[in-house]
């Protein structure tokens, strides 16, 4: 028998520095977690103690904090090189800055192979990108070899900016021939490493012949055997065992997100490459694990540029940006409109001639808007200003919901109107009329939504049975501010870009902004 230790991360999303327990900015260092300096300490400890160790990343290193905004992926290559990752799969967010934003900072600079078997380049890009990522990699580990085959969510064209010259194929269809090729090379221990979410990970384990282990990402799935060490609730045991169609027991793992945990899986193989046993658990990277001093020093050196960036002008406003709770928790506010417009703009993807865009709607809890921005400071808007408006380090995500769920959400928005509560929704691509004289749960008298399958966008009444795409904060997708119906009834959820980054990019693009209050939210009673 031969034993392999798989260390794995996924959906790190730019958390290079240690974070608080909820993966936001670290405030009290003695209670902070994660970060690459702490991760390195643990990885090195395991490498020294165990003979056959692989360190793998299942994608979405890109996007999530000011580190990515400023360094655009160079920080990912630098620190992953320093940690000596063995391989990485491409995630959807690796395409957020287009193909060039992947090639130059990461693909050309990574000392470790970057993988995806189901992304195929065509046209002029094919020769440019050829060999810069691989479908699979054979890694020598001790006296053996291990094959790693990569995959990426085929939804990436809707979630990021891969352009028109990359084709995202069905994962299972693309993986099988690559696994077969590895078999012909006499590689009999094969790990599928990828970024398509836990449901697809399980399907790959079930359907792709020859895959021994699946290491996944995208769905931020937390798996754990025994009593979990922090706040995350396990979606199942670690590893999650799938019985393949050909009768094998295939371990599937994921390690939550944001570098909070290091996945730790021990696999025992027989001489023919069959998995005999698998066990492990994610390791919580809490403050009991010291930060490596040399990596920490390097982080501090790279940090300097971030502090300078925070005070630079992104663009100008010529109007007061009303982000006060007195406005945004009671009525349409122009800060809410600005943020929603930025959210839609960030999700413009012309992937189908029938649709002007794949999504037209935005909802945003008023309680998530934490500060106004005064235009009487020469109109200047900085990252620092935006961080005061959106201080929680969230993301703006894409969900699919039925019209009936949206109707419930808007009823919830005003079910206890007048108490300055955070659930009052700001909107984009939606016209809503409330009648507060009616009883809670029956106050939405008109709800019109902007069409997507149209050449001239116009507002049509919401259809209860239709499925709509909506951009909203991850806080709402997770049922925050009492929006349990969204969490319970959503049909799909893909995590998006950092909230501040979305708004800052929009302001930089527009240069000068002047959002208005324009009748997106109306009240049909005379008192409003």
């Amino acid at each position: 028998a031969w034993e392999l230790t798989i260390l794995h991360t996924n959906d790190v999303h730019s958390r290079l520095e240690q974070t608080s327990e909820d993966s936001s900015k670290c405030v009290n260092a003695s209670r902070c977690m994660g970060g690459v300096a702490r991760l390195f300490t643990k990885v090195q400890q395991i490498r020294r103690a165990e003979p056959n160790v692989l360190l793998l990343d299942a994608g979405d290193q890109y996007q999530g904090t000011i580190w990515f905004t400023v360094y655009k992926g160079a920080e990912v290559a630098h620190f992953m090189n320093a940690l000596r990752y063995d391989a990485m799969a491409l995630g959807n967010h690796e395409f957020d800055n287009g193909v060039e934003g992947l090639i130059e900072p990461l693909l050309k600079e990574a000392k470790f192979p970057i993988l995806s078997a189901n992304i195929k380049a065509k046209g002029p890009l094919a020769s440019q990108i050829s060999g810069l990522y691989l479908p699979y990699k054979v890694l020598p580990v001790g006296d053996e070899v291990v094959g790693i085959v990569g995959y990426t969510s085929k939804e990436t064209p809707f979630l990021s900016n891969p352009g028109t010259n990359l084709v995202f194929e069905d994962e299972i269809t693309a993986l099988q021939p690559e696994v077969d090729k590895l078999k012909t090379l006499n590689v009999n221990k094969i790990i599928a490493l990828g970024h398509s979410g836990f449901e697809m990970d399980k399907l790959i384990a079930q359907k792709v012949r020859g895959v021994d282990v699946v290491v996944g990402g995208h769905s931020n799935t937390f798996l754990y055997t025994g009593n979990p060490p922090s706040k995350e609730v396990p979606a199942g045991k670690y590893p999650f065992i799938v019985t393949s169609d050909d009768g094998r027991k295939v371990p599937v793992v994921q390690a939550y997100a944001f570098g909070k945990y290091l996945g730790y899986l021990k696999i025992e193989f027989d001489e023919r490459g069959n998995v005999i046993s698998s066990h492990g658990n994610p390791i919580l990277l809490n403050s009991s694990i010291p930060e490596d001093p040399s990596i920490k020093a390097d982080i501090n050196k790279w940090r300097i540029k971030l502090d300078n960036y925070s005070t630079q002008e992104l663009g100008k406003t010529i109007v007061y940006l009303d982000g006060s709770s007195q406005s945004c928790r009671f009525r349409e506010c122009n800060m809410g409109n600005l943020i929603c417009d930025a959210m839609i703009n960030n999700n413009l993807r012309h992937t189908d001639e029938m649709f002007w865009n794949h999504v037209s709607m935005c909802i945003l809890n008023g309680g998530g808007i934490r500060s106004p921005i005064d235009e009487r400071n020469n109109g200047t808007i900085t990252w620092e200003n935006l961080a005061a408006v959106l201080p929680f380090g969230g993301t703006f995500d894409l969900v699919q919901l039925k019209g009936s769920t949206l109707k419930k959400a808007f009823e919830h928005s005003v079910h206890r109107y007048g108490q300055s509560t955070g659930e009052f929704l700001q909107v984009g691509g939606i016209h809503v009329v409330y009648d507060l004289s009616r009883k809670p749960g029956d106050r939405v008298v008109k709800l019109d939504v902007l069409c997507t399958k149209c050449r001239v966008p116009s507002y049509d009444p919401l259809k209860m049975d239709e499925v709509y795409k909506v951009i909203l904060p991850n806080f709402l997708a997770n049922g925050g501010d009492g929006f349990q119906m969204i969490k319970d009834e959503l049909l799909r959820h893909d995590s998006g870009d950092q909230d501040i980054n979305v708004v800052s990019t929009y302001i930089s693009k527009m240069k000068v902004i002047y959002p208005a209050v324009e009748g997106r939210i109306k009240f049909s009673t005379g008192s409003h």
Epitope: K108, A110, K111, F112, P113, P140, N186
Partner: nanobody, 126 residues
Framework: EVQLVESGGGVVQTGGSLRLSCAAS????????MGWFRQAPGKEREFVAA????????QFADSVKGRFTISRDNAKNTVYLQMNSLKPEDTAVYYC???????????????????WGRGTQVTVSS
């Protein structure tokens, strides 16, 4: 595009020497471990020599030990195979190969190498 281009092959008499070169482009050269393989007519492709990213680690096939040396010039993005005391059984097409990754000891295994050149013919006449 990642490309490997071999040169320096030719016809040489038994006991003679040749120096093969392989120029790499399209990827940071120091991120690649480099190897040489050869294939004689009707035979399997076989490992000859390999060198780690830094140049500190080398590996050789038993059949060429003491006769062949491998080196790299990271400034020129080139790896060299110096072949001395050549024998007729060294006749083959010689392929340059590159392994994306950083390992202290380069691999002898064909499957580990990700990029391949088109080969250069070496003929040792008796």
């Amino acid at each position: 595009e990642v490309q490997l281009v071999e040169s320096g092959g030719g016809v040489v008499q038994t006991g003679g020497s040749l120096r093969l070169s392989c120029a790499a482009s399209g990827r940071t050269f120091t991120h690649l471990a480099m190897g040489w393989f050869r294939q004689a007519p009707g035979k399997e492709r076989e490992f000859v020599a390999a060198i780690s990213n830094s140049g500190a680690g080398t590996q050789f096939a038993d059949s060429v030990k003491g006769r062949f040396t491998i080196s790299r010039d990271n400034a020129k993005n080139t790896v060299y195979l110096q072949m001395n005391s050549l024998k007729p059984e060294d006749t083959a097409v010689y392929y340059c190969a590159a392994d994306w990754g950083t390992r202290d000891s380069p691999s002898k295994l064909n499957a580990v190498y990700d990029y391949w050149g088109r080969g250069t013919q070496v003929t040792v006449s008796s």
